[in-house]
Amino acid sequence: NQDLPVIKCVLINHKNNDSSVGKSSSYPMVSESPEDLGCALRPQSSGTVYEAAAVEVDVSASITLQVLVDAPGNISCLWVFKHSSLNCQPHFDLQNRGVVSMVILKMTETQAGEYLLFIQSEATNYTILFTVSIRNTLLYTLRRPYFRKMENQDALVCISESVPEPIVEWVLCDSQGESCKEESPAVVKKEEKVLHELFGTDIRCCARNELGRECTRLFTIDLNQTPQTTLPQLFLKVGEPLWIRCKAVHVNHGFGLTWELENKALEEGNYFEMSTYSTNRTMIRILFAFVSSVARNDTGYYTCSSSKHPSQSALVTIVEKGFINATNSSEDYEIDQYEEFCFSVRFKAYPQIRCTWTFSRKSFPCEQKGLDNGYSISKFCNHKHQPGEYIFHAENDDAQFTKMFTLNIRRKPQVLAEASASQASCFSDGYPLPSWTWKKCSDKSPNCTEEITEGVWNRKANRKVFGQWVSSSTLNMSEAIKGFLVKCCAYNSLGTSCETILLNSPGPFPFIQDNIS
């Protein structure tokens, strides 16, 4: 095998400082020193196959798989991962070796597997195989369950690749809409991995372990219903399994179901049918469309047709990586002290997000609700009318999202005063931010109506407490006012509040608080 090229396979571990996912790249970023992966010729394989040493990677770590080819002339290449081809841009290093790289940023379970690199040089063709797995750390994981067809049986297996081993249960419901809520009497739970009764209205599989509970719903089109409010859309990542169930009921068995993708019938082996008679002797048929590992070309409108029902469609969108789509511009709200109000974020995301609401360094649980139009919404109502900055944070395997909210509570100013030897200061947190007046109380002005304008210094907002602005006003002491009572008043559209201070007192000496509405 004299004319075989000299090949070197290396692993480069990166310092994690980037959250985007790159795929095939010719210029990996700054990193640690490369680790040699060997790349030995695989014996007894058809064609020339090199196999690199197995690569174990920590969750969220970033790596580059790199091949250095010492062969004359140009090379062309193609990466294949989970039946999807990824483009490949070889370049040449200073020693004129061909360099091909695959960058994996923030390693996740879905990015583990076999990466095949096909290289064509002027002399020969060959394949290089990398096997990438996630290092078995003590980190617990909880993965969203997915479905597989049971070999030689009309049944579905629910799988969740989680650590520790999760308890898997099917959650079944036979009525429509609201009555299929988790704790409803219409809901039946079966703690088993295999499900044979696949005719129900709503079928979900849930996996739970110490980290919580994750569920996946069997995506269903029901030809006996009018179409859903929005033409349904199902997102999947490259390599994930696709399952869509089409269900129809008719007075007798004389009808059939078919699946089409963009007007072309699905290939044999990508669907299977089941039928049963219901209690009232009507026939129920279900037809599953499935793809064990989706590629980009599985994107499109899937249409289920019947010889006795109107057809319905769903849009399946295959993405390279997960996403969270929402507007991240910050939002300011102004509410009354007893007004009911909730923050809300509307988003579209895949896979499903984990989220938190944070206020004053304290985190609150986050609930999300799916809307009819493919969006989800998370609301937070538990602000207890505390003004300040509220933060919504969401993340999934591939994306992160943060949105800031400011809550202002309309209220009359409340004044706090303090005095020192040289000045008197008043503070207020009313909203809208108050304006200030200072008045001198004297024999001439026992009602404190003589306004002080000299030596007053207002700061609109001198202190931000978790987003809450505090306004202050300071009066510098002068001989003219020493020994007198002075009154600072804060006023806004909701009222006025005052505090009276004796100016020759050595320490803070609030005297009388007036509340004038």
């Epitope: 006996n224 009018t226 929005t230 033409l231 047709s305 006795k308 109107p310 319905q312």
Partner: antibody, heavy 119, light 107 residues
Framework: QVQLVQSGAEVKKPGASVKVSCKAS????????MHWVRQAPGQGLEWMGI????????SYTQKLQGRVTMTRDTSTSTVYMELSSLRSEDTAVYYC????????????WGQGTLVTVSS | DIQMTQSPSSLSASVGDRVTITCRAS??????LSWYQQKPGKAPKLLIY???SLESGVPSRFSGSGSGTDFTLTISSLQPEDFATYYC?????????FGGGTKVEIK
């Protein structure tokens, strides 16, 4: 060929009800949704609702909820649209229209039925 | 509900002219949009579905484009029988909603 034939024009008093029919022929009746769309004189088109002729299930626009009912008779391949508590603003031409699929809506239309509401 | 804004509301053109009508959705509707032609006293007729697919029997001078929120109907060379009112329809979400219509008149 596909044909949707609607019932004739109607004149009704405010508060009354009207029931418009749409008879389908030239295709398998239960295989296609039927929509109802109306058009006030000189105005644009307004979607009213949809019925699944196979099961009879229907859904309506929020604006007409409680006043509109869509039904079907599979033996005669006919769909019906009944509108109650009529008002003068319900004066319009009412069309039935077939859905080829959820991706190709309203591919065949009836000729329209003029409903006039006047005291 | 999704609002469909059609423009212009009317236009005058001559036979042979290239005519463009636009439709904007208040939120993304993917490619789930159809175009209809309506002549006075007649029911609307389907021209384009799924934003750009030409209905069979419709002359090839009609074409549609766009996805998401912005859509266009183009008549490449206006014929005498094309003078009519044109409507867009979104079928992404119920209730289905039509644009306000564009009346194409003879100049």
């Amino acid at each position: 060929q596909v044909q949707l034939v609607q019932s004739g024009a109607e004149v009704k008093k405010p508060g009354a009800s009207v029931k418009v029919s749409c008879k389908a022929s030239g295709y398998t009746f239960t295989n296609y949704y039927m929509h109802w769309v109306r058009q006030a004189p000189g105005q644009g088109l307004e979607w009213m609702g949809i019925i699944n002729p196979s099961s009879g299930s229907a859904s309506y626009t929020q604006k007409l909820q409680g006043r509109v009912t869509m039904t079907r008779d599979t033996s005669t391949s006919t769909v019906y649209m009944e509108l109650s508590s009529l008002r003068s603003e319900d004066t319009a031409v009412y069309y039935c229209a077939r859905d080829r699929s959820t991706l190709v809506p309203l591919d065949y239309w009836g000729q329209g039925t003029l409903v006039t509401v006047s005291s | 509900d999704i609002q469909m804004t059609q423009s212009p509301s009317s236009l005058s053109a001559s036979v042979g002219d290239r005519v463009t009508i636009t439709c904007r959705a208040s939120q993304g509707i993917r490619s789930e949009l159809s175009w209809y032609q309506q002549k006075p006293g007649k029911a609307p007729k389907l021209l384009i579905y799924k934003a750009s697919s030409l209905e069979s029997g419709v002359p090839s001078r009609f074409s549609g484009s766009g996805s998401g929120t912005d859509f266009t109907l183009t008549i490449s060379s206006l014929q005498p029988e094309d003078f009519a009112t044109y409507y867009c329809l979104q079928h992404n979400s119920y209730p289905l909603t039509f644009g306000g219509g564009t009346k194409v008149e003879i100049k």
